[in-house]
Interface confidence: medium
């Protein structure tokens, strides 16, 4: 193959790739806590969003999905399935509704959602 | 790596690929002829729309980007850079415009706009 | 010539679930999105979401959570149901149909939906 | 979301004046802005669409201009039907978005 492309993965069957991550949208509604699991089935998280420049095709997405990022009421932050909290800049969060998860939107949105709301989702994997 | 995982590719570096398909979205605004060599300068061609099963990630694609769907003014079709013509309920056609060129919109839309308006595009790279 | 008529209640209580439908005369259902818009007395225009023949939709996120919106491609009608209604959302709402990406054309006549106790 | 800021709010003119209006989007939306014109107890109508694009129908004396961030909605020679609430929105992307309104009454 020329010098200028390149393999992506590896990820599971009929995901998308990019930049060595590997992405699903989901098109059934669940609840965040069905929609983790669901992810978590399949090897994987929900989305984290570590990086403008890594992941912007996300720019791209229409519609409003769960990631993996949650509010943490004792001491009011936001942080991600494995425990990191989410970076300064990276979102733009939105209080939409009250609730502790939050939707990925467009251009790097993230919109407050309560929990159990059924929504489509997104998972990610990141490969190694 | 597991059975379930496999490679996707290849592609241009830090293009999204997706069932073996190469796809880039460019942000900056080029006219239908520019984009079209913009995309060949790639060693790729714009955006054929084929299978909404195999290309059901565009779905998702917010806004509104030129793609390789041309007007042959002769005969009334609508058909793709290669020359093959435009199958049925692949794409639905809105004429917005008068034009022979089209702008894909999310969920398989296909809107009619003037060849020499400047629009984002999408390049697409088929892998064997 | 393409032209839009609503209808549904006028008056529902606190908690209640709003339900409006737009009927299409004349001109192509699909291929289309049909959209729902209000606003409120003496305010501006708020987008509330919209619909395609295929039933595929967008929904303004800050009303996401309570609005449905439907598709009967055998009418060409579309549907708006908003749940748990209150006084904030007392406005004239309009169907109308999204002319692809570039504008609303043409609007129904509007019906006032007022939310009191 | 995009948000969209008309000014100004309320505009007083004349028969025969030139009145401009202007809208400004809080990001580049390119030239996807449309404007309406509304009455009083009436649906809004469609005049503009694709920033400078005059619908069927509408009188010359209409234009607009602009494209990225800002944009204009000119009236050549403002007419006695032509007092109204004037709407910019923008169809970049989902949740569309209208200005405020520009209420044009007469001097």
């Known amino acids: 193959i020329p010098l200028t492309e390149s393999y992506c993965g590896p990820c599971p069957k009929n995901w998308i790739c990019y930049k060595n991550n590997c992405y699903q949208f989901f098109n059934e509604s669940k609840n965040w806590y069905e929609s983790q699991a669901s992810c978590m089935s399949q090897n994987a998280s929900l989305l984290k969003v570590y990086s403008k420049e890594d992941q912007d095709l996300l720019k791209l997405v229409k519609s409003y999905h769960w990631m993996g990022l949650v509010h943490i009421p004792t001491n009011g932050s936001w942080q991600w399935e494995d425990g990191s909290i989410l970076s300064p800049n990276l979102l733009t969060i939105i209080e939409m509704q009250k609730g502790d998860c939050a939707l990925y939107a467009s251009s790097f949105k993230g919109y407050i959602e309560n929990c159990s709301i059924p929504n489509t989702y997104i998972c990610m994997q990141r490969t190694v | 790596i597991p059975l379930t995982e496999s490679y996707c590719g290849p592609c241009p570096k830090n293009w999204i690929c997706y069932k073996n398909n190469c796809y880039q979205f460019f942000n900056e605004s080029k006219n239908w002829y520019e984009s079209q060599a913009s995309c060949m300068s790639q060693n790729a061609s714009l955006l054929k729309v084929y299978s909404k099963e195999d290309q059901d990630l565009l779905k998702l694609v917010k806004s509104y980007h030129w793609m390789g769907l041309v007007h042959i003014p002769t005969n009334g079709s609508w058909q793709w850079e290669d020359g093959s013509i435009l199958s049925p309920n692949l794409l639905t056609i809105i004429e917005m415009q008068k034009g022979d060129c089209a702008l894909y919109a999310s969920s398989f839309k296909g809107y009619i706009e003037n060849c020499s308006i400047p629009n984002t595009y999408i390049c697409m790279q088929r892998t064997v | 010539q393409v032209q839009l008529q609503q209808w549904g209640a006028g008056l529902l209580k606190p908690s209640e679930t709003l339900s409006l439908t737009c009927a299409v005369y004349g001109g192509s259902f699909s291929g289309y999105y049909w959209s729902w818009i209000r606003q409120p007395p003496g305010k501006g225009l708020e987008w509330i979401g919209e619909?395609?023949?295929?039933?595929?939709?967008n929904y303004n996120p800050s009303l996401k959570s309570r609005v449905t919106i439907s598709v009967d491609t055998s009418k060409n009608q579309f549907s708006l149901k908003l749940s748990s209604v209150t006084a904030a959302d007392t406005a004239v709402y309009y169907c109308?149909?999204?002319?692809?990406?570039?504008?609303?054309?043409?609007w129904g006549q509007g019906t006032l939906v007022t939310v009191s106790s | 979301d995009i948000q969209m800021t008309q000014s100004p709010s309320t505009l007083s003119a004349s028969v025969g004046d030139r009145v401009t209006i202007t809208c400004r989007a809080s990001q580049s939306i390119s030239s996807w802005l449309a404007w309406y014109q509304q009455k009083p107890g009436k649906a809004p109508k469609l005049l503009i669409y694709k920033a400078s694009s005059l619908e069927s129908g509408v009188p010359s004396r209409f234009s607009g201009s602009g494209s990225g961030t800002d944009f204009t909605l000119t009236i050549s020679s403002l007419q006695p039907d032509d007092f109204a609430t004037y709407y910019c929105q923008q169809s970049k992307e989902v949740p569309w978005t209208f200005g405020q309104g520009t209420k044009v009454e007469i001097k």
């Open positions: 619909i395609d023949h295929s039933g595929s939709t």
């Open positions: 109308a149909r999204a002319r692809g990406p570039w504008s609303f054309d043409p």
